[in-house]
């Protein structure tokens, strides 16, 4: 199925031009999305083009500037947050990135009622995390790994924790591994719905081994970056959850929430916290061997001022075929009775679906079913449940938004988005106002992205929030590649692929093929989304065919495919890429002497293994920031899929699945190895070990390092990287410069 037809007609050909690498590096064809910052059922904030913060009321149609760009500019604010009582706005400046989600910043509080900044008892700097209470204008913030509370922005702070210490004890913020692999947030504190209580996590990293690497900077001596980072099998952080009454914080102080006995008996993780009411909280825990998860509902005991988590309110989720959940264990969405909830987990047929849990998981009522997967529950109201899935027309790489009426029996299902802009929009996300009175739909493609506002009752479109008209006009004279999404059926496995074809593609001709691979567990590369990126340029200007293939281990097609790689990383992902390449050759338009593969991170691992598979299929390939041995990667991620690197568990496959073990097989391919020296995530160590193994095997290869760059290789490094990779591929494919 052709998703993005190129608008090329003979008469137009001379006015149309191909994409250039410069277009890509300059972000010439980037798109905009519009996510309303909802502040009520019918109001949202949005930063205007001239940087005023504007409040929009959908029902009255009125809008006014709540915060002037003059105020934003006076502190060089790059972000803001309105207090729920609308009295104050925090302004964030001096943004300083730490890891994937975390950053520090300076915060200023602007008093909207008095039209001036709050002076006195100002916030310290830099702050690691800051947030308003859900009601009123209390502030919680983390400074130097300790949590502080202010009843009002101008009040003196109350210090909640005192044991915070850099790289040792983290309060209210995650350590490296929890941030990257478990919480996927920069914070680890949660206000109760009305701001009565504040829950927070304490992470103790005292016994975790430290990864140390040089940061070269500009000084005479490099500095050493030290990060407590548990690699597979190493000592993990110790986590504790506390809750404090923010009305009288000094009265009893923080109270620890007990860990379920079946979890506490061995190493475990805390995976998420969900407040149900001000006096009921839901915690999710996970065994270190990540196939058992426990959801624990705890209640506040007024008489003892403690939190009680009865065994009758413990719900166990266990996987017998893989790990618990998808990438993460799903989180519950509670219904109005404050005890029952909706949750996505595998059904008996091995597809992730929405279930309704009233008393026990065993008695769960299945809400959705079919050979497709429910992906996200957006909102549950009194009468509707909104979720996304890839059910429509059986394309796993699509996302549509559905509404299930839970107020009526039997519940009826309606696809909200399936027929809205069918050709343009097949991949949606949504953002809901309070009580789902209104919602925004953000369509990511396959056509040019568009964001729209809708009535939550009737689903009627109210207005277009962003339609990327400028982008549409800019692309009118560009020869975009054609894209198609299809599937291969091989040995009872369905391999979905996306093929990006040159604008004047002719099936009777032969084209060089580049495979772009990620392939990590629970990932998906074949998605119906719009993108004008490096591979678009390679197809448009350099005449390459690019293919992305979702093989075993990838997501949203059922547990059989997902859990196929359990305890066996680096085998089937590679096999499936190779199988797909063979199928592509059979299609007749691929020059089998000019096939390359490239990937980043997990994709760098897969591309390296594919190059070293000994098949002779690949002429060359690139690995950017690859994992080279699972013993070098983070415990939480690695052990989820591989178990432990111990003799009595899975050490043998840890050893067999390294890139280094296949060093000899790189002899007959051109290999470009690339890594940032300050990669906190996939450590430079991984590429250093590949390089050492290749040198020891006397195998020639090319390499590029990026000094002081992390896993993202951002800024000027990005330009250098893509220019360098382009030269490498053009040389490999004998394309003139």
């Amino acid at each position: 199925i052709v998703l993005r037809p190129s608008r090329v007609h003979n008469s137009e050909e001379n006015t149309m031009r191909a994409l250039t690498l410069k277009d890509i590096l300059n972000g010439t064809f980037s798109y905009k999305t519009f996510f309303p910052n909802w502040i009520s059922g019918q109001e949202y904030l949005h930063q205007s083009a001239d940087n005023n913060i504007v409040l929009y009321n959908i029902e009255t149609g009125q809008s006014y500037t709540i915060l002037s760009n003059r105020t934003m500019k006076s502190v060089n604010a790059s972000n803001y947050g309105l207090s729920p009582d609308r009295q104050f706005v925090y302004l964030e400046s001096d943004y300083s990135k730490l890891w994937r989600y975390s950053y520090t910043a300076t915060y200023y509080i602007y008093d909207l009622s008095n039209g001036e900044f709050v002076r006195g008892n100002e916030l310290p700097r830099p702050i690691q995390y800051l947030c308003w209470s859900p009601v009123g204008s209390k502030l919680a913030y983390v400074y130097q790994n300790n949590i502080y509370l202010k009843q009002r922005p101008g009040d003196p702070p109350f210090q909640i924790t005192f044991n915070g210490r850099e790289n040792k004890i983290f309060n209210g913020i995650p350590d490296w591994v929890y941030e990257e692999e478990m919480l996927a947030t920069k914070y680890a504190l949660w206000w109760s719905p009305n701001g009565k209580f504040l829950a927070y996590a304490e992470f103790n990293d005292t016994d975790i081994p430290v990864i140390a690497y040089s940061y070269y900077g500009d000084e005479q001596y490099p500095r050493t970056i030290n990060i407590p980072y548990p690699k597979a099998g190493a000592k993990n952080p110790v986590v504790r959850i506390f809750i404090i009454d923010t009305t009288y914080p000094a009265y009893v102080g923080p109270q620890e929430v007990p860990v379920p006995a079946m979890i506490a008996s061995s190493d475990y993780y805390f995976s998420w916290l969900t407040w149900v009411t001000d006096e009921r909280v839901c915690l999710q825990w996970l065994k270190r061997v990540q196939n058992v998860s426990v959801l624990s509902i705890c209640d506040f005991r007024e008489d003892w001022q403690t939190w009680d988590c009865p065994k009758t309110q413990e719900h166990i989720e266990e996987s017998r075929t893989g790990w618990a959940g998808g990438f993460f264990v799903s989180t519950p969405v509670f219904s109005y009775d404050a005890i029952s909830y909706y949750k996505i987990f595998s059904d008996k047929d091995g597809y992730k679906h929405i279930h309704y849990i009233k008393d026990t998981v065993e008695n769960a009522i299945q809400i959705t079913s079919g050979k497709w997967e429910a992906i996200n529950i957006f909102r549950v109201t009194q009468d509707s449940l909104f979720y996304s899935s890839n059910e429509f027309e059986e394309y796993p790489g699509r996302r549509n938004i559905y509404r299930i009426s839970i107020g009526s029996y039997p519940p009826s299902k309606k696809c909200v988005t399936c027929h809205l802009r069918k050709e343009r929009c097949q991949y949606y996300t949504a953002s809901f106002s309070d009580y789902a009175k209104y919602y925004a739909l953000v369509c990511y493609g396959p056509g040019i992205p568009i964001s729209t506002l809708h009535d939550g009752r009737t689903d009627q479109e109210i207005k277009i929030l962003e339609e990327n008209k400028e982008l549409e006009n800019a692309l009118k004279n560009i020869q975009l590649p054609k894209e198609e999404i299809k599937k291969l059926e091989v040995d009872e496995i369905t391999l979905w692929y996306k093929m990006i074809l040159p604008p004047q593609f002719d099936r009777s001709k032969k084209y060089p093929l580049l495979i772009q691979v990620y392939g990590g567990p629970c990932s998906q590369s074949v998605r119906s989304v719009f993108a004008v990126n490096w591979i678009s340029y390679l197809a448009s200007k350099e005449g390459m065919v690019i293919a992305l293939v979702d093989g075993r281990g990838t997501a949203f097609q059922g547990d059989k495919l997902l859990y196929a790689v359990y305890r066996k990383l680096g085998v089937y992902e590679v096999e499936d890429q190779i199988t797909a390449v063979r199928k592509f050759i059979e299609m007749g338009f691929i020059d089998e002497k000019r096939i390359a593969i490239w990937g980043w991170s997990y994709g760098g691992y897969v591309s390296s293994l594919a190059l070293a598979s000994g098949t002779g299929l690949f002429k060359c390939g690139i690995a950017v920031a690859p994992v080279s041995s699972w013993e070098y990667y983070a415990s939480v991620y690695t052990e989820r899929f591989m178990g432990l690197p111990t003799k009595d568990d899975n050490l043998e496959h840890y050893k067999n699945s390294t890139v280094m073990a296949r060093a000899e097989y790189f002899r007959n391919v051109d290999y470009l190895l690339i890594h940032g020296t300050a990669d906190d995530n996939v450590h430079f160590q991984n590429s250093a070990q590949i390089a050492k193994a290749l040198v020891n095997a006397q195998v020639d290869f090319q390499a590029m390092w990026y000094s002081d760059q992390n896993h993202g290789l951002s800024g000027l490094s990005t330009n250098h990287l893509y220019t360098h990779m382009t030269h490498f591929l053009k040389q490999c494919f004998s394309l003139s410069d």
């Epitope: 006014y64 002037s68 609308r86 009295q87 909207l112 008095n114 039209g115 001036e116 709050v118 002076r119």
Partner: antibody
Framework: QVQLVQSGAEVKKPGASVKVSCKTS????????IHWVRQAPGQRLEWIGG????????NYNDKFKGRVTITVDTSASTAYMELSSLRSEDTAVYYC?????????????????WGQGTLVTVSS | DIVMTQSPDSLAVSLGERATINCKSS????????????LAWYQQKPGQPPKLLIF???TRESGVPDRFSGSGFGTDFTLTISSLQAEDVAVYYC?????????FGQGTKVEIK
Amino acid sequence: QVQLVQSGAEVKKPGASVKVSCKTSRYTFTEYTIHWVRQAPGQRLEWIGGINPNNGIPNYNDKFKGRVTITVDTSASTAYMELSSLRSEDTAVYYCARRRIAYGYDEGHAMDYWGQGTLVTVSS
Amino acid sequence: DIVMTQSPDSLAVSLGERATINCKSSQSLLYSRNQKNYLAWYQQKPGQPPKLLIFWASTRESGVPDRFSGSGFGTDFTLTISSLQAEDVAVYYCQQYFSYPLTFGQGTKVEIK
């Protein structure tokens, strides 16, 4: 010349409410917040609260919270202060005053123009 | 809340003589970021609203005679009338606008001796 003109004197019974208006002119209404200050006989000036006409957001002195409501009508460039559950000790002259909005981080302004005052007498 | 205390409560000065009023705040009104003191002085004559004389502790409001001057920083401030005139008979108030609630001193009554 900038003007803040307040409504006339009021006599109220205990438990009643009073609403005082402050009509402004000859300046840009939305460039200033409006504040209310009272002065009981022989007492110091006492700040009641203020409001930002741009967003209609009020700020009240905790002492008056629950009893005072400050509002604005931007189209009429007028601010209002309503005080409920009146008691004899609320007998005072009530003033409105303007204060320039501080957009910048280093700004901060005093109340530069005041209304003529409204005498509110609470007596049974 | 910041408490403002003025001294003396009343002051009688001969015409042409200097009058000095002190004002003390319970916490510093000096803002470290701009080194400004958030203190104002007002003059109130009988039956009239207060009139702004001085802001930022020492900056004269336009139209205010230069015999009025303000000084001090942090917690201690002074209003000086260098040469008292008959029309200066009034009650003078200091006020902090450093933080909310805004608070005033109890006032100093200036009379002619």
